[in-house]
Interface confidence: low
């Protein structure tokens, strides 16, 4: 069937439309287009004869129409009057006619709309605002947007005048937003520029900050006032009802008790004509004095004296606080507080009690700190230390010994050799020593303030021949795969080389062996039973050499998984069962047996005479090494046949 399709159906003014013919019959003589829904010679647009391929304009031809051989009609530069129906009249070769009608609609291109308002500065909770979308256009749809969102559902929002007018009743500050209107028809859509609604509101009840209402004498009072308002509020301050200034902030430096009172902030909005006030009560307290600490003993002696620290001044209805090393007081039987906490007593002071100490005065408003106080605790001298630690020297070298003992005040030192006073210095120096310089070297440290003295004696041997060394160990019974052992070659001698042998051989290369301390110390990490060998150390210098006696390392190990012998598991009735259990272990383990889980005897050998099938079962040997704390076991099944 012959049909006509309009492409597009809705056409914008100035554009073009194609009336496209479908199912055009064959064997045609020609065809003709008419404006309207029927064939009317007065409204013919154009005719076309196929044989001559000639198009003939009709009365309704406007010069904007083009006809195609397939009968389709293109109309260009469309005007509003072109809207409507178009009829195609087809004449076939057999002179039988056929008609089809199509249509399209013409719409104007919409202009960019704009928003008009009946109230540019509405007052919150009082005014209404009506926005109107201009211009008024026929066959157009009107839409509204708030902050680029479609209109929210609200009883205060009303659309009227074919949606062209948007009314906001009882505006609020939250209505301050971007408003746009949009016009639409089938061929175009245009959005207006934003209109920002400026809602006048406030002032709300002002807020005074900061919130605190208590101050100390001498502080600065700096109050700030803020009230939500559009336009911004104008502020005034009143103190005890008396006007002070028209500013948002009130600043009073170095306040006194006389500045206590009621402080009022008034906010005024000149556009809404509204005023709001907020009152805060400020209390100014007198400044308490700064505390300080007094002491009954500024130079106490360690382990002898007590010290009483007192927090001054004495003030009624005051809490006293104490800190040591910037921490609250530790719990200690040597620290005692008086009933009012004003006096802190340190019983039997130690050198660690130096402080610093601080006291504080606490009232209902604040805590004030004293300056820190440090105690000068007299102590020592402790046992002096003589360095270096060498005890053997070769003739001809210089002997330089230094003595040190912890002490306050610093100790005074004296040196004695074989009981004879030498000199009153911290260091003793003897050049080019000989065998005659061998002897007992005593350092005496004296504390003049406490009157205490302490001494340390060191034996010095001067000899060309080195002494026979010995080996000391930090662990005489190390446990396998657990402990480390450090051997040290004694004595420590100056300009001496230290050597080590294991089972008469030089040290093997092993990541578990480490030499340190100038090769004087040999450390075995994660000892094994294979480390249970003879260790010898040697010392040598340019004139002599000597070796220690061997030291055998006693490594505790095991027990390993035991072995039950003989290996037989099948026996004849009437035979004797004689099982022996053995496990590698140092020291030897304790043995015990269980048959079918029942404890038997604590022996290495289990003997049962003339066994019967009743002796069938599991025989377990348990081993335990009390020194390593380790246990092990093995189970064997025994079958006795009749």
């Amino acid at each position: 069937k012959l049909t006509i399709e309009s492409t597009p159906f809705n056409v914008a003014e100035g554009k073009e439309v194609l009336l496209l013919v479908h199912n055009l019959p064959q064997h045609l003589f020609g065809y003709s287009w008419y404006k309207g829904e029927r064939v009317d010679g007065n409204r013919q647009i154009i005719g076309y004869v196929i044989g001559t391929q000639q198009a003939t304009p009709g009365p309704a031809y406007s010069g904007r129409e083009i006809i195609y051989p397939n009968a389709s009609l293109l109309i260009q530069n469309i005007i509003q009057n072109d809207t409507g129906f178009y009829t195609l009249h087809v004449i076939k070769s057999d002179l039988v006619n056929e008609e089809a009608t199509g249509q399209f609609r013409v719409y104007p291109e919409l202009p960019k709309p704009s928003i008009s308002s009946n109230n540019s500065k509405p007052v919150e909770d009082k005014d209404a605002v009506a926005f109107t979308c201009e211009p008024e256009t026929q066959d157009a749809t009107y839409l509204w947007w708030v902050n680029n969102q479609s209109l929210p559902v609200s009883p205060r929002l009303q659309l009227s005048n074919g949606n062209r007018t948007l009314t906001l009743f009882n505006v609020t500050r939250n209505d301050t937003a971007s408003y746009k209107c949009e016009t639409q028809n089938p061929v175009s859509a245009r959005r207006s520029d934003s209109v920002i609604l400026n809602v006048l509101y406030g002032p709300d009840a002002p807020t005074i900050s900061p919130l605190n209402t208590s101050y100390r004498s001498g502080e600065n009072l700096n109050l700030s006032c803020h009230a939500a308002s559009n336009p911004p509020a104008q502020y005034s301050w009143f103190v005890n009802g008396t006007f002070q200034q028209s500013t948002q902030e009130l600043f009073i430096p170095n306040i006194t008790v006389n500045n206590s009172g009621s402080y009022t902030c008034q906010a005024h909005n000149s556009d809404t004509g509204l005023n709001r006030t907020t009152v805060t009560t400020i209390t100014v307290y007198a400044e308490p004095p700064k505390p300080f600490i007094t002491s009954n003993n500024s130079n106490p002696v360690e382990d002898e004296d007590a010290v009483a620290l007192t927090c001054e001044p004495e003030i009624q209805n005051t809490t006293y606080l104490w800190w040591v090393n910037n921490q609250s007081l530790p719990v200690s039987p040597r620290l005692q507080l008086s009933n009012d906490n004003r006096t802190l007593t340190l019983l039997s002071v130690t050198r660690n009690d130096v402080g610093p100490y601080e006291c504080g005065i606490q009232n209902e408003l604040s805590v004030d700190h004293s300056d820190p106080v440090i105690l000068n605790v007299l102590y020592g001298p402790d046992d002096p230390t003589i360095s270096p630690s060498y005890t053997y020297y070769r003739p001809g070298v210089n002997l330089s010994l230094s003595c040190h003992a912890a002490s306050n005040p610093p100790a005074q030192y004296s040196w004695l050799i074989d009981g004879n006073i030498q000199q009153h210095t911290q260091e003793l120096f003897i050049s080019n020593i000989t065998e005659k310089n061998s002897g007992l070297y005593t350092c005496q440290a004296n504390n003049s303030a406490s009157g205490h003295s302490r001494t340390t004696v060191k034996t010095i041997t001067v000899s060309a021949e080195l002494p026979k060394p010995s080996i000391s160990s930090n662990n005489s019974k190390p446990v396998e795969d657990k402990d480390a052992v450090a051997f040290t070659c004694e004595p420590e001698a100056q300009n001496t080389t230290y050597l080590w042998w294991v089972n008469g051989q030089s040290l093997p290369v092993s990541p578990r062996l480490q030499l340190s301390n100038g090769n004087r110390t040999l450390t075995l990490f994660n000892v094994t039973r294979n480390d249970a060998r003879a260790y010898v150390c040697g010392i040598q210098n340019s004139v002599s050499a000597n070796r220690s006696d061997p030291v055998t390392l006693d490594v505790l190990y095991g027990p390993d998984t035991p072995i039950i012998s003989p290996p037989d598991s099948s026996y004849l009735s009437g035979a004797n069962l004689n099982l022996s259990c053995h496990s590698a272990s140092n020291p030897s383990p304790q043995y015990s047996w269980r048959i079918n889980g029942i404890p038997q005897q604590h022996t290495q050998v289990l003997f049962i005479a003339k066994i019967t099938p009743n002796n069938n079962g599991t025989y377990a040997c348990f081993v335990s090494n009390l020194a390593t704390g380790r246990n092990n076991s093995i189970v064997k099944s025994i079958t006795v046949s009749a």
Partner: nanobody, 124 residues
Framework: EVQLVESGGGVVQPGGSLRLSCAAS????????MGWFRQAPGKEREFVAA????????YYADSVRGRFTISRDNAKNTVYLQMNSLRPEDTALYYC?????????????????WGQGTLVTVSS
């Protein structure tokens, strides 16, 4: 704008522990003494603990001394309240507050800025 934001509150059984945090912004944190206060339903807001700007000295109400520990991290602009051995009477809204220099405030007076609070409920 100065903001103090508390967190870490919740429900805990008696004897349990909680750690409250207060994150500060909009102020020079290292020059402020920080305090913790609490307000139980129907009661006045009361002092709990305070720590001076350097963190070297701390102060506690008698009711919490030995159980609560106040600390601060000036690098993170945060003050903490570690609460151990909690009791039902510790149930309250806990507030963080800031006081600029000056002596240490042991009441609500003297504190310039306050947080909104975090709820701590101690119940079996």
């Amino acid at each position: 704008e100065v903001q103090l934001v508390e967190s870490g509150g919740g429900v805990v059984q008696p004897g349990g522990s909680l750690r409250l945090s207060c994150a500060a912004s909009g102020l020079t944190f290292s020059t402020y003494t920080m305090g913790w206060f609490r307000q139980a339903p129907g009661k006045e807001r009361e002092f709990v603990a305070a720590i001076i700007w350097s963190g070297s000295n701390t102060y506690y109400a008698d009711s919490v001394r030995g159980r609560f520990t106040i600390s601060r991290d000036n690098a993170k602009n945060t003050v903490y309240l570690q609460m151990n051995s909690l009791r039902p009477e510790d149930t309250a809204l806990y507030y963080c507050a800031a006081q600029h220099f000056g002596p240490i405030g042991l009441t609500t007076r003297g504190y310039h800025y306050w947080g909104q609070g975090t709820l701590v409920t101690v119940s079996s």
